[in-house]
């Protein structure tokens, strides 16, 4: 399963910070960037960085310290970008981000400098079932896999 | 630092089992999959397996289906090994390793961390 | 399970001069995701494996730039610009993409 986030400061939920998104085992979490086909708004496009944070740096929206991760930089705002998260428990040689059943990550964006737009939230919950077992083993495997 | 103990030797009776320990420190023990790997005496490495400590979740090598079993114990940071109805092909030196990740910009880089490794002999 | 082949078997270099090590495996080692999971390990004598490159090409943390990865599908090599001392030990190739992980069979560095 896809799940769809279309992450800009239209959306309220992510704007409100209450926007919580369950996702099981093997799905994806798919973010827009934000578009513009024309000249963009007045105040100029939207461009940030987004962040895994823990609960501290969500709650207060800053991405600093440690446990802050960027993970993606929306910096295209006349291009077509979109990134995607698996939620996997295994990465190869845990080359990747792993994630654990039952755990909630948190997600937020921070504003470039030169850009319009505000502090986003998201709060994804990994639920502890897969829901499709795509092989009877995880390919790879070294914590990994 | 991060660090895995791991007792220097073992001598066993074959058809006998042996527990293998290897202590964490150093990093949140719950966080990341602890491996197995075996080496033969002036062979290879071979993968037996790994056990994630957050719910104990297991995949093994089928090589090693029978021969091992994965446990951990939260409480001490320790993982386990048992090995049962050794023989001498079972002789070998078995190293833990986990992989412990941090994050340089958007990519993910994991650094391996091995313990040094018990020798198990297998012997009458 | 994929097979790892390693050549040679022993490698011996003059100090200060340039060697290489091949490894060979069954399948592509190339993962869905677009990488490549392969590493390179030393194991000094009387010490534990540690790895020194993975993604076939990136030196892991304290790692000198003399030694190089390259390849790609299941053809890979390490080369080292200028051997050292501190150098010799056994090479591993270990493979992640594919379950099991797997390694190859070592090449031992002397030096001559």
């Known amino acids: 399963l896809r799940h769809v986030v279309y992450w800009n400061s239209s959306n309220p939920r992510l704007l409100r910070g209450d926007a919580v998104v369950e996702l099981g085992l093997n799905d994806y979490l798919d973010i827009v960037c934000p578009h513009y086909e024309g000249p963009g708004p007045p105040e100029g496009p939207e461009t940030f960085a987004l962040y895994m944070v823990d609960w501290p740096g969500y709650e207060s929206c800053q991405a600093e310290g440690p446990r802050a991760y960027k993970r993606w930089v929306c910096s295209l705002p006349f291009g077509h970008v979109q990134f995607s998260e698996k939620i996997q428990r295994f990465t190869p040689f845990s080359l990747g981000f792993e994630f654990l059943p039952g755990e909630t990550y948190y997600y937020i964006s921070v504003p470039t400098p030169e850009s319009s737009g505000q502090c986003l939230r998201l709060q994804v919950s990994v639920c502890c079932k897969e829901r499709k077992s795509e092989s009877a083993h995880p390919v790879g495997s070294p914590g990994e896999s | 630092q991060v660090q895995l103990q791991q007792p220097g030797a073992e001598l066993v009776r074959p058809g006998a089992s042996v527990k293998l320990s290897c202590k964490a420190s150093g990093y949140t023990f719950t966080r990341d999959w602890m491996h197995w790997i075996k080496q033969r005496p002036g062979q290879g490495l071979d993968w037996i397996g790994t056990?994630?400590?957050?719910?104990?979740?297991?995949h093994y090598n089928q090589n090693f289906k029978d021969k091992a079993t994965l446990t951990v114990d939260k409480s001490s940071s320790t993982a386990y090994m048992q090995l049962s109805s050794l023989t001498s092909e079972d002789s070998a030196v078995y190293y833990c390793?986990?992989?412990?990740?941090?994050?340089?910009?958007?990519?993910?880089?994991?650094?391996?961390?091995w313990g040094q490794g018990t020798s198990v002999t297998v012997s009458s | 399970d994929v097979v790892m082949t390693q050549t040679p078997l022993t490698l011996s270099v003059t100090i200060g001069q340039p060697a290489s090590i091949s490894c060979k495996s069954s399948q592509s080692l190339l993962h869905s995701d677009g990488k490549t999971y392969l590493n390179w390990l030393l194991q000094r004598p009387g010490q534990s494996p540690k790895r020194l490159i993975y993604l076939v090409s990136n030196l892991d943390s304290g790692v000198p730039d003399r030694f190089t990865g390259s390849g790609s599908g299941t053809d890979f090599t390490l080369k080292f610009s200028r051997l050292e001392a501190e150098d010799l030990g056994v090479y591993y190739c270990?493979?992640?993409?594919?379950?099991?992980?797997?390694f190859g069979g070592g090449t031992k560095l002397e030096i001559k």
């Open positions: 270990w493979q992640g993409t594919h379950f099991p992980q797997t």
């Open positions: 056990i994630h400590p957050y719910d104990s979740e297991t």
């Open positions: 390793v986990t992989f412990i990740k941090t994050m340089v910009d958007t990519y993910y880089y994991a650094m391996d961390y």
